[in-house]
């Protein structure tokens, strides 16, 4: 807490000026009016104040706005934002995407901090849904943002926002999240032609069901192994050797290198060995010739 002292003669600030970098903390407290500071926050960012000086400026704003800063101040916080706590941010009502962008810019290049997470949470809750522009902005600053949301939160993403998603934005998503995102992507890209559709849907396929994979296998898509390895195991298991061959195209040779990893391993165990042999890859572990394959799930359904 900075002691309350009178401002020395000649040091009263009439605007936020670069000479203030010479002021000691108590002089800033005594000589800079909080209302003046609030109206000239943009100038603060052009001046290399020390962290200690920024503490004083923050304290002045906190005193002026005990219920939370107005958006006109928040938008121009600049690097003073780094001094804010999640508790401070929970008092804010941020509605402008420009404000969000301005604050994310300050934290650019760093991991998502608790402050940023709180800011985004406040912003998205205020908007009611993750619209395309917001998602565009968030994934531009934090490619992993989408995958940090719960399936419940992802359910509020409208299909139109999926257009903003880049493949790298989904790198850390788990199957539960892709299960939510895939149907939205399918809907968003439904009017595209085959090859263009596949390019767009590819990174979402970790949430695709068997029937969609079967349909893709009829379209000469040549799925790469990296995408195939991210498919749901339960969606891959019912695919026939012929369907997988069509799905992968020239990439089918890559199955050999992945035969000990899921979902390839589990898929091999479900295929007839003579069907696997037709691939000519030397894949082993299929069902030996002459064995009867019982579909227990079908049997249970019948009984």
């Amino acid at each position: 807490e900075v002691e309350k002292t009178a401002c020395p003669s000649g040091k009263k600030a009439r605007e936020i000026d670069e000479s203030l970098i010479f002021y000691k903390k108590w002089e800033l407290e005594a000589c800079v009016d909080a209302a003046l500071l609030a109206t000239q926050m943009d100038r603060v960012n052009a001046i290399p104040f020390t962290y200690e000086q920024l503490d004083v400026l923050k304290h002045k704003l906190d005193e002026l706005y005990p219920q939370g800063y107005p958006e006109s101040v928040i938008q121009h916080l600049g690097y003073l934002f780094l001094k804010m706590s999640p508790e401070d941010i929970r008092k804010w009502n941020v509605t402008s995407l420009e404000t969000l962008k301005a604050l994310l810019e300050v934290n650019k290049g760093h991991e998502m901090s608790p402050q940023v997470a709180t800011l985004i949470d406040r912003f998205v809750k205020g908007r009611g849904q993750l619209d395309k522009d917001t998602l565009d902005t968030l994934t531009a600053f934090y490619p992993g943002y989408l995958c940090s949301l719960s399936p419940e939160e992802l359910s509020s993403v409208p299909p139109s926002s999926i257009w903003a998603v880049r493949p790298q934005d989904l790198d850390t998503c788990d199957p539960r999240q892709l299960d939510v995102l895939y149907p939205k992507a399918r809907l968003a890209f439904q009017n595209m032609n085959g090859s263009e559709y596949f390019v767009k849907i590819q990174s979402f396929l970790g949430g695709a069901p068997t029937e969609d994979l079967k349909a893709l296998s009829q379209q000469n898509v040549s799925m790469d192994l990296a995408t195939f390895m991210k498919l749901r195991t339960d969606a891959v298991l019912p695919l026939t050797v012929a369907e997988v061959q069509k799905l992968l195209g020239p990439h089918v040779e890559g199955l050999k290198a992945e035969e000990r990893h899921r979902p390839v391993r589990d898929w091999i165990l479900r295929q007839r060995q003579d069907d696997l042999d037709t691939l000519g890859l030397g894949l082993q572990g299929g069902i030996p010739n002459g064995y009867l394959v019982l579909d227990l799930s079908m049997q249970e359904a019948l009984s």
């Epitope: 000649g10 009439r14 000026d17 000479s19 970098i21 010479f22 000589c31 290399p48 020390t50 200690e52």
Partner: antibody, heavy 121, light 108 residues
Framework: QVQLVESGGGLVQPGGSLRLSCAAS????????MSWVRQAPGKGLEWVSA????????FYADSVKGRFTISRDNSKNTLYLQMNSLRAEDTAVYYC??????????????WGQGTLVTVSS | DIVLTQSPATLSLSPGERATLSCRAS??????LAWYQQKPGQAPRLLIY???SRATGVPARFSGSGSGTDFTLTISSLEPEDFAVYYC??????????FGQGTKVEIK
């Protein structure tokens, strides 16, 4: 009364190093930003470097950036200037000066008598 | 960078005369100027700070004025001890502590 006394000047070869000191008295040294200003023989004043009262920030003229380092020891009331890779054009009287300020105005209110640095082979 | 240009380079006057020294900035100076006096073999001495405030112990015959790009130091009536070199100086983040090249006030 305020007193600033520089020391450490002398003759040094090009490429050599020198460390100047400025002993301050008569005021609370730790309350003031400090600076070095130099004056080549027969020339005008040229600011060299400045340091905040708590060493939180330092400033340098382009002509010395990367070669000179300003520092201070508030417990000893002393300001320093470490000069490396000295050049002939660094030859000058080096003054230690106290920085004072008002709103929108930053100036040197007290100066030492200076110490001569000569860079020559 | 801000450049301060002082004029004239030399001012030849007699004791008792009025001296007007000019300092012009290459661009608008947001802050205030300071003026210093330097006599041969001595350190500079602060005369005026904040464009117009006299430093402690400086006689009333010295006055400063101006803003923006044009600043003036006036010595209302020259005393013998006033013959010296005078420097103007400004401070800004982009051009910290810039000095003018000096004006020499000599006895006519």
């Amino acid at each position: 009364q305020v007193q600033l006394v520089e020391s450490g000047g002398g003759l040094v070869q090009p490429g050599g190093s020198l460390r100047l000191s400025c002993a301050a008295s008569g005021f609370t040294f730790s309350d003031y930003a400090m600076s070095w200003v130099r004056q080549a023989p027969g020339k005008g004043l040229e600011w060299v470097s400045a340091i905040m009262y708590d060493s939180s920030s330092t400033f340098y003229a382009d002509s010395v950036k990367g070669r000179f380092t300003i520092s201070r020891d508030n417990s000893k009331n002393t300001l320093y200037l470490q000069m490396n890779s000295l050049r002939a054009e660094d030859t000058a009287v080096y003054y230690c000066a106290r920085i004072n300020y008002i709103y929108k105005g930053v100036h040197f209110d007290y100066w030492g008598q200076g110490t001569l640095v000569t860079v020559s082979s | 960078d801000i450049v301060l240009t002082q004029s004239p380079a030399t001012l030849s006057l007699s004791p008792g005369e009025r001296a007007t020294l000019s300092c012009r900035a290459s661009q608008i100076v947001s802050g205030y100027l300071a003026w210093y006096q330097q006599k041969p073999g001595q350190a500079p001495r602060l005369l005026i700070y904040g464009a117009s405030s006299r430093a402690t112990g400086v006689p009333a015959r010295f006055s400063g004025s101006g803003s923006g790009t044009d600043f003036t130091l006036t010595i209302s009536s020259l005393e013998p001890e006033d013959f010296a070199v005078y420097y103007c100086q400004q401070w800004s983040l982009r051009s910290p502590f810039t000095f003018g090249q000096g004006t020499k006030v000599e006895i006519k």
